[in-house]
């Protein structure tokens, strides 16, 4: 039957929709089995994967999807909504111990680094030669940023500057890398995230580095100290163009909602952080940039700055996109989308 909605995460969706949210027709599952096995850990029930219907064979948190046969968009989600009255499946299972955000093996930190002043993962996204947004280098060819940073569909309008401290690149000539943008991959519906693919991989050196992603579905303790970085609006008349940092601390979603006078109900896909210093926080030009937290001496991007409800309003904590909620999607894109070789 032509089911028009799905329950939970759509793992059992058996409808006959065969078109993606981008308007592409789905390709036959049997043509893509090799790719599925190579890239995606999944629990195969071959009988479900008939024809080219939208399905969710890998338990994707964001619903049914399909392959497209289009090399630009190898797979995409389908335009099916959750059934009315059905609640979003929680990613945090309260029956189990809280998942740590840092990647650890038997309590030991993997790739942990001491806190340092290096912010080599910070990207300045340029639109028509001017800084428009921040971003985080999470892999040599991938920058995590926000969809509000892209007023044009012409990728020639953008470039990514890496290895800089000054928004104009003054004094950063030796360390600056300027890279073209080859693709924008928009996040799941309502996420406000974009994975921006670079035309060639960044060269990792003393000035350019990647930042870690948190574990999927992890929670970070309240009052954890974090930072936001950006070249955005500072309120200063003689802004020097240098990268700014604001120190924030993690606040639970309920408490955060109270600070917003109950006008805001936070979703599981959001994370909240309040300012240590009254009136500091992200603003225009900082969008797309990271909320960076440290756990077990490991720095991670836990949030992405998106346009919100005013800039740095006293006693109003900032609301960010919770990266841990989208970590599986990020990994799936990085695994399945082709990147240029260096």
């Amino acid at each position: 039957s032509g089911q028009d909605c799905y329950r939970g995460n759509g793992k059992n969706y058996m409808g006959q929709l065969s078109q993606t949210r981008s308007g592409l027709t789905c390709s036959m599952w049997d043509k893509n089995m090799e790719d599925l096995h190579r890239h995606i850990f999944w629990e195969p029930d071959a009988s479900k994967l008939n024809e080219n219907y939208c399905r969710n064979p890998d338990d994707d948190a964001h619903g049914p999807w399909c392959y497209t046969g289009n090399p630009l968009i190898p797979w995409d989600y389908c335009p099916i909504s959750r059934c009315e009255g059905d609640t979003t499946p929680g990613i945090v299972n309260l029956d189990h111990p809280v998942i740590s955000c840092a990647k650890t093996i038997e309590g030991r930190v993997v790739n942990g680094i001491p806190t340092r002043t290096n912010i080599g993962w910070m990207v300045s996204l340029r639109y028509r030669n001017k800084h428009i947004c921040g971003g985080s280098l999470i892999k040599e060819s991938w920058v995590l940023t926000a969809r509000q940073c892209f007023p044009s569909r012409d990728l020639k309008d953008y470039e990514a500057w890496l290895g800089i401290h000054d928004v104009h690149g003054r004094g950063d000539e030796k360390c600056k890398q300027v890279l073209q943008v080859s693709q924008l991959v928009y996040g799941p519906e309502g996420s406000d995230l974009v994975l921006m693919k670079l035309a060639r991989p960044a060269v990792l050196d003393d000035f350019v580095s990647t930042i870690d992603l948190p574990n999927y579905g992890c929670t970070i303790p309240e009052k954890t100290s974090c930072s936001v970085y950006g070249w955005g609006y500072t309120g200063l008349i003689n802004y020097d163009g240098l990268l700014r940092v604001a120190h924030l601390y993690i606040m639970g979603n309920e408490k955060c909602s109270q600070h917003h006078r109950g006008k805001v109900t936070l979703q599981e896909s959001e994370i909240c952080a309040g300012a240590e210093k009254i009136g500091s926080g992200p603003c225009e030009g900082d969008y797309g940039g990271p909320l960076v937290c440290e756990q077990h001496k490991m720095r991670m991007v836990l949030g992405v700055i998106v346009p919100g409800r005013g800039c740095a309003i006293p006693n109003r904590p900032g609301i960010f996109v919770r990266v841990a909620y989208y970590a599986k999607w990020i990994h799936k894109i990085i695994l399945t989308y082709k990147v240029p070789q260096s």
Partner: antibody, heavy 120, light 112 residues
Framework: QGQLQQSGPELVKPGASVKISCKAS????????MNWVKQRPGKGLEWIGR????????NYNGKFKGKATLTADKSSSTAYMQLSSLTSEDSAVYFC?????????????WGAGTTVTVCS | DVVMTQTPLSLPVSLGDQASISCRSS???????????LHWYLQKPGQSPKLLIY???NRFSGVPDRFSGSGSGTDFTLKISRVEAEDLGVYFC?????????FGSGTKLEIK
């Protein structure tokens, strides 16, 4: 989701100019395109052009170049459209419309429309 | 400019019937990024148009599931599975793949 409040109806003489306004609320004004659409009585919709308030970028339909000028004031979250050298052909309802950025690029918030009547 | 041809111009239906509106573009609406920016709007008498379907087949929030969109390339269809009184008005298809953006001439859905 946002709202757009347009200025009131205008009655103008041929050859004159008119400037209509559109005040945005409930969303980040500088992070969406503002479009303008014309509708003549009983007729279809015609796209005039758009402005990106964050940067002041504009795109125009060739047919309206020289006729319409789009501006935006970020501080008051208001977009403006000036129509010049008016003729009876310019009598229409003009809508301001928010265009959601990618991956959507659709018109999701429409103003109520401003009626411009050109008569001698 | 991309010409959007909508048929029929007028569509008389009985309540509860299925309605189907066709929209054809003079060139492909597939953008170089792989997306197809073909949308459908409904304008009720005396009101502004409202978004129904975006990018061929995505229902906008709050739009009932009796509305569905399909198609690809240059040929697109809007279907209403069971017409209700509140569905009456003028339906426009629109493309935002190519500048200038263009609209179809509209299809008036009315009671038979």
């Amino acid at each position: 989701q946002g709202q757009l409040q347009q200025s009131g109806p205008e009655l103008v003489k041929p050859g004159a100019s008119v400037k209509i306004s559109c005040k945005a609320s409930g969303y980040v004004f500088s992070s969406s395109w503002m479009n303008w659409v014309k509708q003549r009585p009983g007729k279809g919709l015609e796209w005039i052009g758009r402005i990106y308030p964050g940067y002041g970028d504009t795109n125009y339909n060739g047919k309206f170049k020289g006729k319409a000028t789009l501006t935006a004031d970020k501080s008051s979250s208001t977009a403006y459209m000036q129509l010049s050298s008016l003729t009876s052909e310019d009598s229409a309802v003009y809508f301001c419309v928010r265009e959601e950025l990618g991956p959507y690029w659709y018109f999701d918030v429409w103003g109520a429309g401003t009626t411009v009547t050109v008569c001698s | 400019d991309v010409v959007m041809t909508q048929t029929p111009l007028s569509l008389p239906v009985s309540l509860g019937d299925q309605a189907s509106i066709s929209c054809r573009s003079s060139q492909s609406l597939v953008h170089s990024n792989g997306n197809t920016y073909l949308h459908w709007y409904l304008q009720k008498p005396g009101q502004s148009p409202k978004l129904l379907i975006y990018k061929v087949s995505n229902r906008f929030s709050g739009v009932p599931d009796r509305f569905s969109g399909s198609g690809s390339g240059t040929d697109f269809t809007l279907k209403i599975s069971r017409v209700e009184a509140e569905d009456l008005g003028v339906y426009f298809c629109s493309q935002s793949t190519h500048v200038p953006y263009t609209f179809g001439s509209g299809t008036k859905l009315e009671i038979k």
